[in-house]
């Protein structure tokens, strides 16, 4: 099959590739000596495992399903990775003061298997 | 219900000094940062600048740098736009707006508040 | 002069699909994101679409976003009187933060 499989997450609820959001502070990131603001980021990623077919992205990431199956000590099974991401604005520190700077690839916005 | 409260019209001469204000409610007021936004008589929206309000960090348009000045008053929830000597070019409504979450846009808006400038 | 391009006009009947347009350059939309506020009459601006294509919580999905390369469109379907208003779109620019475009007019004929 050509497209992109459902939903349906064989290995239960949840347990599947999918959008996690996990509360961090600048310490955690390791970003304090160089962001100010915000304070504290809701860190959006795709966590999960991708079972067979499950939200693959791609024709490759169906091929590599069936081969890990036929060889998975050779062929790893597919990541669960962002499909596509939220843009992010940071206050940062600069030389002369600080500065806002955009991020386009900073937060997940969905995910799919690849 | 997230809310933007601005203070009321004002009209002063020009060389005049003047403080708005705009309080914000509903929400955790240090968590989210404020913008300040322009519009002219009959003319479009123009970015003046940012501030954060707990930590009071400031960042101006290029086009406003200098001319005004943006604080913040953490205690009482509230965000400041103020002229040392106001121009009649100053004449316009002042919006203050609540960014979004990623900081990329304006969730919420006060009503406005419009600034005479005039002799 | 706008960082963002818009017509300053619009207008359609009610009940057809109407399209305003804003185009950047590879220094904003090319490279990031576009935000939709539309703003009635006597009013405040309000959040009408975020990120390209979506809508915040009660805007109806009568109104949608889109984008490719240097250019983005807010579409609107089924136009009723009260979508009269003026439509702005917002990025982000390298040199000066946040831009607005110049706005755009939409008349509701009839």
């Known amino acids: 099959a050509r497209a992109r499989n459902g939903d349906h997450c064989p290995l239960g609820p949840g347990r599947c590739c999918r959008l996690h959001t996990v509360r961090a502070s600048l310490e955690d990131l390791g970003w304090a000596d160089w962001v100010l603001s915000p304070r504290e980021v809701q860190v959006t990623m795709c966590i999960g495992a991708c079972p067979s077919q499950f939200r693959a992205a791609n024709m490759h990431a169906q091929i590599k399903t069936s081969l890990h199956r036929l060889k998975p000590d050779t062929v790893p099974a597919p990541c669960c990775v962002p499909a596509s991401y939220n843009p992010m604005v940071l206050i940062q520190k600069t030389r002369t003061g600080v500065s806002l700077q955009t991020y386009d690839d900073l937060l997940a916005k969905d995910c799919h298997c690849i | 219900e997230v809310q933007l409260v601005q203070s009321g019209a004002e009209v002063k001469k020009p060389g005049e000094s003047l403080k708005i204000s705009c309080k914000g409610s509903?929400?955790?007021?240090?968590?989210?940062?404020i913008g300040w936004v322009r519009q002219m008589p009959g003319k479009g929206l123009e970015w003046m600048g940012v501030?954060?309000?707990?930590?009071?960090?400031?960042i101006y348009s290029p086009s406003f740098q200098g001319q005004v000045t943006i604080s913040a008053d953490k205690s009482i929830s509230t965000a400041y736009l103020q002229w040392s000597s106001l121009k009649a070019s100053d004449t316009a409504m002042y919006y203050c707006?609540?960014?979004?979450?990623?900081?990329?846009?304006?969730?919420?808006w006060g009503q406005g508040t419009l600034v005479t400038v005039s002799s | 002069q706008s960082v963002l391009t818009q017509p300053p006009s619009v207008s359609g009947a009610p009940g057809q699909r109407v399209t305003i347009s804003c185009s950047g350059s590879?220094?904003?939309?090319?490279?990031?994101?576009v935000n939709w506020y539309q703003q009635l009459p006597g009013t405040a601006p309000k959040l009408l679409i975020y990120?390209?294509?979506n809508r915040p919580s009660g805007v109806p999905d009568r109104f949608s976003g889109s984008k490719s390369g240097t250019s983005a469109s807010l579409a609107i379907t089924g136009l009723q009187a009260e979508d009269e208003a003026d439509y702005y779109c917002?990025?982000?620019?390298?040199?000066?933060?946040?831009?607005f475009g110049g706005g755009t007019k939409l008349t509701v004929l009839g």
């Open positions: 707006a609540r960014y979004g979450r990623y900081g990329t846009y304006f969730d919420y």
């Open positions: 509903g929400y955790s007021f240090t968590s989210y940062w």
């Open positions: 501030i954060d309000p707990d930590g009071s960090y400031t």
């Open positions: 590879s220094s904003n939309i090319g490279v990031l994101y």
């Open positions: 990120s390209n294509d």
């Open positions: 917002q990025s982000w620019d390298s040199s000066s933060n946040y831009v």
